[in-house]
Amino acid sequence: PEPPTACREKQYLINSQCCSLCQPGQKLVSDCTEFTETECLPCGESEFLDTWNRETHCHQHKYCDPNLGLRVQQKGTSETDTICTCEEGWHCTSEACESCVLHRSCSPGFGVKQIATGVSDTICEPCPVGFFSNVSSAFEKCHPWTSCETKDLVVQQAGTNKTDVVCGPQDRLRA
């Protein structure tokens, strides 16, 4: 008879046998035979395997190197890797978060559209007409120009994307 060529999803083919895969968090010690089951062992401290597998070695948990601005966001288990994130004011340079860079500041004339997180940089946007930003900041949005009218004042100097309007008193009409 032909040996099997396929196995069910939580099995693997070895020596014409369909053996059980090891569950997440465990590594393969020995393959099954006709009369013995697959032998698996739990991963050690600081190790993990996150899939049904036939690996003979568990993977090491990721190290969140503080020298690279990293810290632990979520501690790894025998079934999951450690998740790193960046220290306050920094964000990851890649999806894998292997190193961090300082959050970008938005220059004068630009405001913060989206504040940076541990995994994404600051998103800046140009201040539209009617708004300004006169500082370099990673938090400040564009501010609306002052409304002189509501203060019973008139515009003495027009605002720009970097400066607020300057208000002054209205000229008195001579009798």
Partner: antibody, heavy 127, light 107 residues
């Protein structure tokens, strides 16, 4: 309620073709491996074919290899069995059955079984 | 292919009896064996998986044992609803195979 419902059976001439369908409901169909099992009148159960959850892996009984094709459409929760070059000995009730892996929390090896079955559809091959 | 041989092919028993059905595999299949119950005109129903684990909702009078090549299904005290045909199935490797069945009839 977890349910499987077969359709597409009927009377067909030897050498003819038929396509059986199995509609799944009440569970995440795309996460399960599936099987077709048949039973000739007055006889025992005979496993016919297997398909993995993604449809990537299939297997067949020697008696139907090269004539039957199993497939699935996970977006429609449907399992199919295309039967070509039908013979009198293919006359049977055809059941679709869900493969389930029983996970062992103790860390021992888990085990498979077919835990949900349809009511079956009758296929008669006769001239 | 792996052959499964059930014995006996049929047996007659009374309510309250203890009944044992055996299933022998042509090669070692570890504990990759399931037992099913089938009543006339109905689909099979899973009773035991992994040779000895009871499926949810199945009465505790049913039990399975064995490993390798020899397996047994035991019904400790037969009830009227237990009269049916019983099948073993190996899920060790493809092609998956069933035993020929054991018909349990009322005395």
């Amino acid at each position: 309620e977890v349910q499987l419902l077969e359709s597409g059976g009927g009377l067909v001439r030897p050498g003819g073709s038929l396509r059986l369908s199995c509609a799944a409901s009440g569970f995440t169909f795309g996460s399960y491996e599936m099987n077709w099992v048949r039973q000739a009148p007055g006889k025992g159960l005979e496993w016919v074919s297997y398909i993995s959850s993604s449809g990537e892996t299939t297997d067949y009984a020697d008696s139907v290899k090269g004539r039957f094709t199993v497939s699935r459409d996970n977006s429609k929760n449907l399992l199919y069995l295309q039967m070509n070059s039908l013979r009198a000995e293919d006359t049977a009730v055809y059941y679709c059955a869900r493969d389930v892996f029983f996970f062992s929390p103790s860390g021992d090896n888990g085990a498979y079984g077919m835990d949900v079955w349809g009511q079956g559809t009758m296929v008669t091959v006769s001239s | 292919d792996i052959q499964l041989t059930q014995s006996p092919s049929s047996l007659t028993a009374s309510v309250g009896d203890r009944v044992t059905i055996t299933c022998r595999s042509s090669q070692g299949i570890r504990s990759s064996l399931a037992w099913y119950q089938q009543k006339p005109g109905k689909p099979p129903k899973l009773l035991i998986y992994g040779a000895s684990s009871l499926e949810g909702g199945v009465p505790s009078r049913f039990s399975g044992s064995g490993s390798g090549t020899d397996f047994t299904l035991t019904i400790s005290s037969l009830q009227p609803e237990d009269f049916a045909t019983y099948y073993c199935q190996q899920l060790n490797s493809f092609p998956s195979t069933f035993g020929q069945g054991t018909k349990l009839e009322i005395k």
